[in-house]
């Protein structure tokens, strides 16, 4: 044990993908512990990750209660219990996070092409509707359930034998595109929320090509 001063947390950063939301901060604690509190603008502060030596806190359970609310978190620093610090009464040190509105700011996770099916000169490409940790009536909602028509997918597709890409867009999770008969095509999709100003696009999905397992071909 010893005498030491606590230091305030800094670099508070929200890391959020498909509403899985973690607050990270620095520094690694030396002779101190942290407690995180989270609140909406009009709500009460709620303690999470209480008395922890971690430098991250999973706040998903709180933000999924209402993803359209704006949240603020704060990280308190306390001297560890083995620290013989004797100062006068004083509020604990804390640092506020940036405000965070999950609906507007959570990153869109990398989408996955669930399947594609060719019928003649048409191909139907289906994007997996990823489950989120947002609940309604005790069931987890999908990304589409949460975002509705705010979410679109962009399909990039090209002949396996060439590099020229075409694009298609949908506000569902399915594309129906025209292809040349007898040609193999490759596909990649990207999730997009056009109305956003930040974090508008996901990374591209893994590429899937015709003639591989996910596809089906019918005359």
């Amino acid at each position: 044990s010893g005498t030491t001063n606590t230091v305030a947390a800094y670099n508070l950063t929200w890391k959020s993908t498909n509403f899985k939301t973690i607050l990270e901060w620095e520094p690694k604690p030396v002779n101190q512990v942290y407690t995180v509190q989270i609140s909406t603008k009009s709500g009460d502060w709620k303690s999470k990750c209480f008395y922890t030596t971690d430098t991250e806190c999973d706040l998903t359970d709180e933000i999924v209660k209402d993803v359209k609310q704006t949240y603020l978190a704060r990280v308190f620093s306390y001297p560890a219990g083995n620290v013989e610090s004797t100062g006068s009464a004083g509020e604990p040190l804390y640092e506020n996070s940036p405000e965070f509105t999950p609906y507007l700011e959570t990153n869109l996770g990398q989408p996955t092409i669930q399947s594609f099916e060719q019928v003649g000169t048409k191909v139907n490409v289906t994007v997996e509707d990823e489950r989120t940790l947002v609940r309604r009536n005790n069931t987890f909602l999908s990304l589409r359930d949460v975002f509705g028509k705010d979410l679109i997918y962009t399909l990039y597709y090209w002949k396996s034998s060439s590099s020229g890409k075409k694009t298609a867009k949908t506000n569902t999770n399915e594309f129906l595109i025209d292809v040349d008969k007898g040609e193999n095509y490759c596909f990649s999709v990207q999730a997009v929320i056009p109305s956003r100003t930040v974090n508008r696009k996901s990374t591209d999905s893994p590429v899937e090509c015709m003639g591989q397992e996910k596809g089906e071909f019918r005359e």
Epitope: T35, F50, F76, P79, G90, P92
Partner: nanobody, 114 residues
């Protein structure tokens, strides 16, 4: 300096219960952590339990559901209900409040013996 005054210690038989209380001499903000530590003979002081202003708790592993910490923000008080006491729980129990600094009470002796 925040003064913390404990009460409720004493002699109890193994398997018995005791309730400790601690009151602060001045208003303790709800952002403070309050709790209890103990020092057994020949050992370092160790955390027993702590509680946040909104009632979130953290217990040492050795507590194993035997102790319950609670807090009354209006009374600037923290409590520790100790059940199923064993001789290993014999120690001086210190009230603790942490804000910018740690504050400690003088301690109250708990002796578990038949």
């Amino acid at each position: 300096q925040v003064q913390l005054v404990e009460s409720g210690g004493g002699l109890v038989q193994p398997g018995g219960s005791l309730s400790l209380s601690c009151t602060a001499s001045e208003t303790i903000s709800s952002t403070y952590i309050m709790g209890w530590h103990r020092r057994s003979p020949g050992k370092e002081r160790e955390l027993v339990a702590v509680i946040s202003g909104d009632g979130v708790t953290h217990y040492a592993d050795f507590v194993k559901g035997r102790f319950v910490i609670s807090r009354d923000n209006a009374k600037n008080a923290v409590y520790l209900k100790m059940n199923f006491l064993t001789p290993e729980d014999t120690a001086v129990y210190y009230c603790y409040a942490a804000g910018r600094w740690n504050h400690w009470g003088q301690g109250t002796q708990v002796t578990v013996s038949s």
